[in-house]
């Protein structure tokens, strides 16, 4: 057992069918010696008497919040959560498999340039007494400061019969270094209850892995004479980090019919423009990655050829 | 929301089996862990079993341990209570119940409550 926070403990179950369960011991939190008792939630119910009470924890239905009282005044409160071990694996029912980029991803996370600012998100199908709670480090035998928000519900999805919630949290490392070289990865930890279940998800990353940079910005299209060729232009994003000659970005162009079964052409360039043919109906596309070091591609920036 | 309707209740002989199903519909069932509870007349509602989301855990009370079984289908979004051996002691109308607490045999972890399917057992 082991306390979350004031007056909320978490027990460690490892559970099986018989199983024996945790011996807890609670004690009343209290100078008063004598005439104590105690309940279990809003049951007037006694289940002891003294200044401890010892109980069996072997599932949810013995958590809970315990208080002690002493002729009708309430004299402590110990809230007793469950975190269930089975087969030798701590449960994630709270959170759901994002299964990107592989099986067991319950948190992704996303750094627009390498300011040591990034966003972790996660979902869940449950919609109510649920809370979060998310701390972060960089690296964890020494760690370094990072500081995380709270965390926010950030969308909610219809999927089929389903609604699918979306939470999402900001974190920044509070002594970032953009141009270093990353030794140490960044922890993010969520603590995540649902009514009476404890359940904890841990993701580790480096900034550079987990970089997206943001579209492009300011497209434009200028036709040349005489030509059905088109010179596209852009921006680095207004989030990128600066300055551009160091932290650079490449661009692929993308030439896509109205079809989605049309031949797309596709031209890549460091440069912020590029020479490309406008069929009629088709749209120009540009997206961004960090040019020297392979993490996501940006969302695509587009506008229609006519 | 979920809702759950039950069936396969009916008259017995001590001694015999009956199966009981209860199908799921509305939100996703494989989310939800399923149990079994029942009520005798002018009693409280008394546990029964349990099952986790996935199909692979169950719990028993002890009265019904060695007795009962119960399973589920996700494909079918239902949850079945195999009662063999019965008494006259399990008379009662058996609910079905889904929450996201496994194990729990306290009725207030779970969420949603079907209406009851009578179970008589005549020695």
């Known amino acids: 057992i082991w306390e979350l926070k004031k007056d909320v403990y978490v027990v460690e179950l490892d559970w099986y069918p018989d199983a024996p369960g945790e011996m807890v011991v609670l004690t009343c939190d209290t100078p008063e010696e004598d005439g104590i008792t105690w309940t279990l939630d809003q049951s007037s119910e006694v289940l002891g008497s003294g200044k401890t009470l010892t109980i069996q924890v072997k599932e949810f239905g013995d958590a809970g919040q315990y208080t002690c009282h002493k002729g009708g005044e309430v004299l402590s409160h110990s809230l007793l959560l469950l975190h269930k071990k089975e087969d030798g694996i701590w449960s994630t029912d709270i959170l759901k498999d994002q299964k990107e980029p592989k099986n067991k991803t319950f948190l992704r996370c996303e750094a627009k340039n390498y300011s040591g600012r990034f966003t972790c998100w996660w979902l869940t199908t449950i919609s109510t007494d649920l809370t979060f709670s998310v701390k972060s480090s960089r690296g964890s035998s020494d760690p370094q400061g990072v500081t995380c928000g709270a965390a926010t519900l950030s969308a909610e999805r219809v999927r089929g019969d389903n609604k699918e919630y979306e939470y999402s949290v900001e974190c920044q490392e509070d002594s970032a270094c953009p141009a270093a070289e990353e030794s140490l990865p960044i922890e993010v930890m969520v603590d995540a209850v649902h009514k009476l279940k404890y359940e904890n998800y841990t993701s580790s990353f480096f900034i550079r892995d987990i970089i997206k940079p943001d579209p492009p910005k300011n497209l434009q299209l200028k036709p040349l004479k005489n030509s059905r060729q088109v010179e596209v232009s852009w921006e680095y994003p207004d989030t990128w980090s600066t300055p551009h000659s160091y932290f650079s970005l490449t661009f692929c162009v993308q030439v896509q019919g109205k079809s989605k079964r049309e031949k797309k052409d596709r031209v890549f360039t460091d440069k912020t423009s590029a020479t490309v043919i406008c069929r009629k109906n088709a749209s120009i596309s540009v997206r961004a990655q960090d040019r020297y070091y392979s993490s996501s591609w940006s969302e695509w920036a587009s506008v229609p050829c006519s | 929301e979920v809702q759950l309707v039950e069936s396969g209740g009916g008259v017995v002989q001590a001694g015999e089996s009956l199966r009981l199903s209860c199908a799921a519909s509305g939100r996703i069932f494989s989310d939800y862990e399923m149990g079994w509870f029942r009520q005798a007349p002018g009693t409280e509602r008394e546990f029964v079993a349990a099952?986790?989301?996935?199909?692979?855990?169950?719990y028993y009370a002890d009265s019904v341990k060695g007795r009962f079984t119960i399973s589920r289908d996700n494909a079918k979004n239902t949850v079945y209570l195999q009662m063999s051996s019965l008494k006259p002691e399990d008379t009662a109308v058996y609910y079905c119940a889904a929450g996201r607490l496994f194990p729990s045999s306290r009725s207030r972890d779970y969420d949603y409550w079907g209406q009851g399917t009578q179970v008589t057992v005549s020695s």
């Open positions: 099952i986790s989301w996935r199909g692979s855990s169950t």
